[in-house]
Amino acid sequence: MAVTACQGLGFVVSLIGIAGIIAATCMDQWSTQDLYNNPVTAVFNYQGLWRSCVRESSGFTECRGYFTLLGLPAMLQAVRALMIVGIVLGAIGLLVSIFALKCIRIGSMEDSAKANMTLTSGIMFIVSGLCAIAGVSVFANMLVTNFWMSTANMYTGMGGMVQTVQTRYTFGAALFVGWVAGGLTLIGGVMMCIACRGLAPEETNYKAVSYHASGHSVAYKPGGFKASTGFGSNTKNKKIYDGGARTEDEVQSYPSKHDYV
């Protein structure tokens, strides 16, 4: 029961994590305009992996895709690649883990096969989570590097746009979504690997030797502290590994009712 719970929870946590990675990859707010020097701007810029957007205070938003591939900075391409690899591995891991779930019966699949599939999906989730965390961290590092280099005509490394003196970019919501989602996927993967240990049948090098006495038939297994009557199965005591993770909702601060500018 503990194994099933651990495996099921690992699957759910990974599912949420991968959904978060997909959401982060699609989000436009990877970097947002830093308003420290200009808090009263009527034009707000933010950028994603695939397009850059401008939101006017009038409420109109215009987004433009990065329609070039070769013209994009290598770092941005690397982040895209890491996120896509993370999504693909996560998606495959989810497919594999569905078939590996102990609560789902598929033909006469043995526990050893399910254990292998659980381990495979766990490893995939771990790598997927690491890819997402790495991608987001590389992008964050890129932002930190560029933050103080906001001189006129500086190449921002974001789709080849020219930057004026005032505009600097800081961490956007997608980075935090990506970090949390990557972490969840990683935790889910670890839980799957733990569940795999519980699913794997214990293999012994020696066959059990039966000694037939005049009375009851009792089977003795060498090297063990357990004895069985041959009718019931051994019950194993296992720890339940409860991997919990919290996500913080992004809080969007609206202008106050009395915003003086």
């Epitope: 200009n38 034009v43 950028q47 401008v54 921002t156 004026t164 003196v165 915003d259």
Partner: antibody, heavy 118, light 113 residues
Framework: QVQLVQSGAEVKKPGASVKVSCKAS????????MNWVRQAPGQRLEWMGQ????????KYNGNFKGRVTITRDTSASTAYMELSSLRSEDTAVYYC???????????WGQGTLVTVSS | DIVMTQSPDSLAVSLGERATINCKSS????????????LTWYQQKPGQPPKLLIY???TRDSGVPDRFSGSGSGTDFTLTISSLQAEDVAVYYC?????????FGGGTKVEIK
């Protein structure tokens, strides 16, 4: 078609308050910021503040030092601008204007003349 | 606050001739995100509210005759009336649409010579 109809002219004494209304029609009132701009005789246009009727958010020009209050009644598609502690230099034509793409004012009310005189 | 300075204060041009109005801002109005200049031009005839002519420094509003054109970038902008008509007699204002508080130029009065 879009129309912004303002209330009639007002004569006020110094220290009093004035409340000007602006009734919108021909568009979704709640979806566009409504601005107030004034024009004193021989002076340049001066932006006073704006309100988003959808949620009541407001932004004000700090030069008015908290004397301006902008409100709205979405059910009546009407925006209001109240200016308190009136002075003679507040004598001006007050306009409401819809905020549009490019952060410009694409439709204006006909204007309301507010005269502050003792 | 961004200060908008218009020149000249008044301008007398013959019918059919070109009229040029200048507007200078104390800070750049160019937004790097979309490479657009947040400057707007309005026309105000006597006894009427201002009328939108041009936004984003060079984009004409619908219904505005093509003899009106806007140009410039950063801090220096120009409104040009290629062939002045009698109905173009008015005061023209530029407006900073980039930073709060939104500010206007002092206006340029265009008359017929």
């Amino acid at each position: 078609q879009v129309q912004l109809v303002q209330s009639g002219a007002e004569v006020k004494k110094p220290g009093a308050s004035v409340k000007v209304s602006c009734k919108a029609s021909g568009y979704a009132f709640s979806n566009y910021w409504m601005n107030w701009v004034r024009q004193a005789p021989g002076q340049r246009l001066e932006w006073m503040g704006q309100i988003y009727p959808g949620n009541g958010d407001t932004k004000y020009n700090g030069n008015f030092k908290g004397r301006v209050t902008i409100t709205r009644d979405t059910s009546a598609s009407t925006a209001y601008m109240e200016l308190s502690s009136l002075r003679s230099e507040d004598t001006a034509v007050y306009y409401c204007a819809r905020y549009y793409r490019g952060n410009c004012f694409d439709y204006w009310g006909q204007g309301t003349l507010v005269t502050v005189s003792s | 606050d961004i200060v908008m300075t218009q020149s000249p204060d008044s301008l007398a041009v013959s019918l059919g001739e070109r009229a040029t109005i200048n507007c200078k801002s104390s800070q750049s109005l160019l937004n790097s995100g979309n490479q657009k200049n947040y400057l707007t031009w309005y026309q105000q005839k006597p006894g009427q509210p201002p009328k939108l002519l041009i936004y984003w420094a060079s984009t004409r509003d619908s219904g505005v005759p093509d003899r009106f054109s806007g140009s410039g970038s950063g801090t220096d902008f120009t409104l040009t009336i290629s062939s002045l008509q009698a109905e173009d007699v008015a005061v023209y204002y530029c407006q900073n649409a980039y930073t709060y508080p939104l500010t206007f130029g002092g206006g340029t009065k265009v008359e017929i010579k």
